[in-house]
């Protein structure tokens, strides 16, 4: 038997993946648990095996179809259950009526590349991955640049309040190594959150021309 409080949080990547984390205060020794997804309007249902990510939390990804296939709509509700094996039976440990487009977390942006670099500025572009057709242009981005001697946490956030998959970084120092990250968020959804940060893109500004002030 399991006692204690539990928390069951899931996000939809807007296409064909629901990622879930289940936290449980009480001890769970050698218990097999899974998440079961049952949509109210669709013909499929799906399960994934919960795997430990810490002493009291488990995670899994419900793969609903091919990565770019649109498996849910803005009108769908998915009943999500945490089921744990108790002897020969499955016990429902947590349940929620999940509205996918109210609980969005997109995939991190991909394909970051330097379009053009100068001594003091750098133009960078990226692409969004597995984003639904529903969003049209209703996305926003945050970006950050890692300067030498600083941490990511210290980097100021640059906000792009529209679907703009490029940025021109200004007032950079010549001949300096930088790293850049970006993340994306749909404007839709009460519980929607930012995507993970992209993989960092390393770039170096051009050296200042000899004999010129910088």
């Amino acid at each position: 038997a399991v006692n204690g409080t539990s928390q069951f949080t899931c996000f939809y990547n807007s296409r064909a993946n629901i990622s879930c984390v289940w936290s449980q205060d009480g001890a769970l020794q050698d218990t097999s648990c899974q998440v079961h997804a049952w949509p109210d309007r669709r013909r499929w249902n799906q399960t994934c095996e919960l795997l430990p990510v810490s002493q009291a939390s488990w995670a899994c990804n419900l793969i609903l179809g091919a990565p770019d296939s649109q498996k849910l709509t803005t009108v769908d509700i998915v009943t999500l259950r945490v089921l744990c094996r108790e002897g020969v039976r499955w016990r429902v440990m947590a349940i929620q009526d999940f509205k996918p487009f109210e609980n969005l977390r997109l995939m991190a942006p991909i394909s970051l590349q330097v379009v053009h670099v100068e001594t003091h500025r750098c133009n960078i572009s990226w692409e969004i991955s597995q984003a639904s057709h529903y969003f049209e242009r209703h996305l926003e981005f945050e970006a950050r640049t890692l300067s030498p001697g600083h941490t990511w946490e210290e980097a100021p956030l640059l906000t792009l309040k529209q679907k703009q998959e490029w940025i021109c970084l200004e007032t950079l120092t010549p001949d300096t190594q930088y790293e850049f990250q970006v993340r994306v968020k749909p404007l839709q959804g009460e519980f929607t959150t930012w995507s993970p940060w992209s993989q960092p893109l390393a770039f170096r500004t051009k050296p200042a021309a000899l004999g010129k002030d910088t």
């Epitope: 109210d40 309007r41 669709r42 013909r43 296939s69 649109q70 709509t73 803005t74 009108v75 509700i77 009526d97 639904s132 057709h133």
Partner: antibody
Framework: QVQLVQSGAEVKKPGASVKVSCKAS????????ITWVRQAPGQRLEWMGD????????NYNEKFQGRVTITVDTSASTAYMELSSLRSEDTAVYYC?????????WGQGTLVTVSS | DIQMTQSPSSLSASVGDRVTITCRAS??????LNWYQQKPGKAPKLLIY???GLHSGVPSRFSGSGSGTDFTLTISSLQPEDFATYYC?????????FGQGTKLEIK
């Protein structure tokens, strides 16, 4: 087997209301949306709204401007569609259907005639 | 609302023919497109769901394809019982909407 059986034909005067029933059998009534679709003579099918019997949640086509009300009686596995302030252009066959990735089972239809 | 437009509106064909009906949505509906067959005085019957899924009991001569805004229903070899009116329907968003229908007649 899954069956949806609708109430019989109705003749109504303009301004009146009509309530059509749809009795479901052969599946768990509370687990699937019931939708209502109508078809005026020679016209395309027109979605009116739907209801999830397990929760009572409803969605309506704004075209009907609050004239349509969809309800269920789960104890009788029956859905209802009421259309008020009837006008002649509401003369149509009204269908209920179960939604499961498309409308996979349909009632036989109920002809509603609005005439003075 | 999403407008659904079918073409042609009517079509004459013979038993054994291969027939294609197209459906165009006024905006991207991904794969949330269903096809129905209706005969006079009867309720529609679901043929294809989610663009290409064959509903149970529907003969394999019916197939669907497409994505985004353009979709097709194909009947590979017409049978006498296939002469009817066919409708496409989007369930991408409320209000769900139907095409105007394609009447398939015997040549």
């Amino acid at each position: 087997q899954v069956q949806l059986v609708q109430s019989g034909a109705e003749v109504k005067k303009p301004g009146a209301s009509v309530k059509v029933s749809c009795k479901a059998s052969g599946y768990t009534f509370t687990s699937h949306w019931i939708t209502w679709v109508r078809q005026a003579p020679g016209q395309r099918l027109e979605w009116m709204g739907d209801i999830y019997p397990g929760s009572g949640n409803t969605n309506y086509n704004e075209k009907f401007q609050g004239r349509v009300t969809i309800t269920v009686d789960t104890s009788a596995s029956t859905a209802y569609m009421e259309l008020s302030s009837l006008r002649s252009e509401d003369t149509a066959v009204y269908y209920c259907a179960r939604e499961r990735g498309g409308f996979d089972y349909w009632g036989q239809g109920t002809l509603v005639t609005v005439s003075s | 609302d999403i407008q659904m437009t079918q073409s042609p509106s009517s079509l004459s064909a013979s038993v054994g023919d291969r027939v294609t009906i197209t459906c165009r949505a006024s905006q991207d509906i991904s794969n949330f497109l269903n096809w129905y067959q209706q005969k006079p005085g009867k309720a529609p019957k679901l043929l294809i769901y989610y663009t290409s899924g064959l509903h149970s009991g529907v003969p394999s001569r019916f197939s669907g394809s497409g994505s985004g805004t353009d979709f097709t229903l194909t009947i590979s070899s017409l049978q006498p019982e296939d002469f009817a009116t066919y409708y496409c329907q989007q369930d991408n968003n409320h209000p769900y909407t139907f095409g105007q229908g394609t009447k398939l007649e015997i040549k």
